[in-house]
């Protein structure tokens, strides 16, 4: 049976050209954790397998890092990481927990001001 | 501490079986794949046989299948492997080295943790 | 059956220096491929899985790169204690999985 629940930072937003860090946490479980997927839509960003520890998807070396803890720091972004992100926390006996969180990336205050002001 | 620890090995004449065993601890048998890489004294190495975390799924190199079976006891954290119709080509150190993966992430098929081998002679 | 080849056989490096060990596959296997070293007496030792990953507490000075059929393992600047046998292998979802023939790396 599976007793867990896994607590994420749910729906968060950014600075385009900033960083932010994705956090889940399994809880109410005393499951063991095995390997931690990151997903975005259908694409593997990360893994963080308890014997290997972490791969980074060669796609997104350069802006994504391992961590904190079984989270993951996402660098130099852009809209087009809007979107849905999956923590999959693959545990023995439970199973396979998910946990969403709904990242906005948005212009920057100052590129706004920008582009609204902009002399012609 | 992860730890594999074969035993089961020796001198065996061609055509003679032996049963290798590997005494798991520090780590959660059940859910991980578990593999058997042997080597050749002064050879490279060469990956014997495979076998998923409930036991239930099993796969063999072309040169063992039909004399070796690979099989494991999750209740006494043991791996084995029951070697028939032994040939002087199966002399080698064999050695039990733990999958990364579990049913529910997947198999590696690669081996960070290994034990420190068993040497099984095929000789008259 | 996809037959991973290593070349040098033996590779003769001084300390300090950097060696580049190669490994072919018959037919891709993607990036399923890993690295190990072994020292006579002991058991493989994981260096390099995904082709370019390191695994779990291994020093900065080995890479690997490469996908398809061609890779490359590199040790930056050599150990003493980086004197040893290296074999690639690959994993491609199906058995078998195979390994090089290993090469070794002995002191110049």
């Known amino acids: 049976m599976m007793t867990g629940t896994i607590e994420t930072t749910g729906n968060i937003s950014a600075e385009k050209g900033g960083s932010i860090i994705l956090q889940c946490h399994l809880s109410s479980t005393t499951a063991q954790v095995t390997q931690v997927n990151w997903e975005q839509q259908d694409q593997l960003l990360a893994i963080c397998n308890a014997d290997l520890g972490w791969h980074i998807s060669p796609s997104f070396k350069d802006r994504v890092a391992p961590g904190p803890g079984l989270g993951l720091t996402l660098q130099s972004l852009t809209v087009n990481d809007t979107g849905e992100y999956f923590c999959i926390y693959h545990t023995y006996p439970d199973g396979t927990y998910t946990g969403r969180i709904f990242l906005e990336v948005l212009e920057s205050s100052v590129a706004e001001h920008g582009a609204r002001f902009q002399i012609p | 501490e992860v730890q594999l620890l074969e035993s089961g090995g020796g001198l065996v004449q061609p055509g003679g079986s032996l049963r290798l065993s590997c005494a798991a601890s520090?780590?959660?048998?059940?859910?991980?794949?578990m593999s058997w890489v042997r080597q050749a004294p002064g050879k490279g190495l060469e990956w014997v046989s495979a076998i998923s975390g409930s036991g239930a799924s099993t796969w063999y190199a072309d040169s063992v299948k039909g004399r070796f079976t690979i099989s494991r006891d999750n209740s006494k954290n043991t791996l084995y492997l029951q070697m028939n119709s032994l040939r002087a080509e199966d002399t080698a150190v064999y050695y039990c080295a733990k999958d990364p993966g579990t049913h529910y992430s997947g198999y590696y098929y690669i081996w960070r943790y290994w034990g420190q081998g068993t040497l099984v002679t095929v000789s008259s | 059956e996809i037959v991973m080849t290593q070349s040098p056989a033996t590779l003769s490096v001084s300390p300090g220096e950097r060696a580049t060990l190669s490994c072919r596959a018959s037919q891709s296997v993607s990036s399923n491929l890993a690295w190990y070293q072994q020292k006579p007496g002991q058991a493989p030792r994981l260096l390099i899985y995904s082709a370019s990953t390191r695994a779990t507490g291994i020093p900065a000075r080995f890479s690997g790169s490469g996908s398809g059929t061609e890779f490359t393992l590199t040790i930056s600047s050599l150990q003493s204690e980086d004197f040893a046998v290296y074999y690639c292998q690959q994993y491609v979802p199906h058995p078998p999985f195979t390994f090089g023939g290993g090469t070794k790396v002995e002191i110049k």
């Open positions: 520090g780590f959660t048998f059940g859910p991980y794949g």
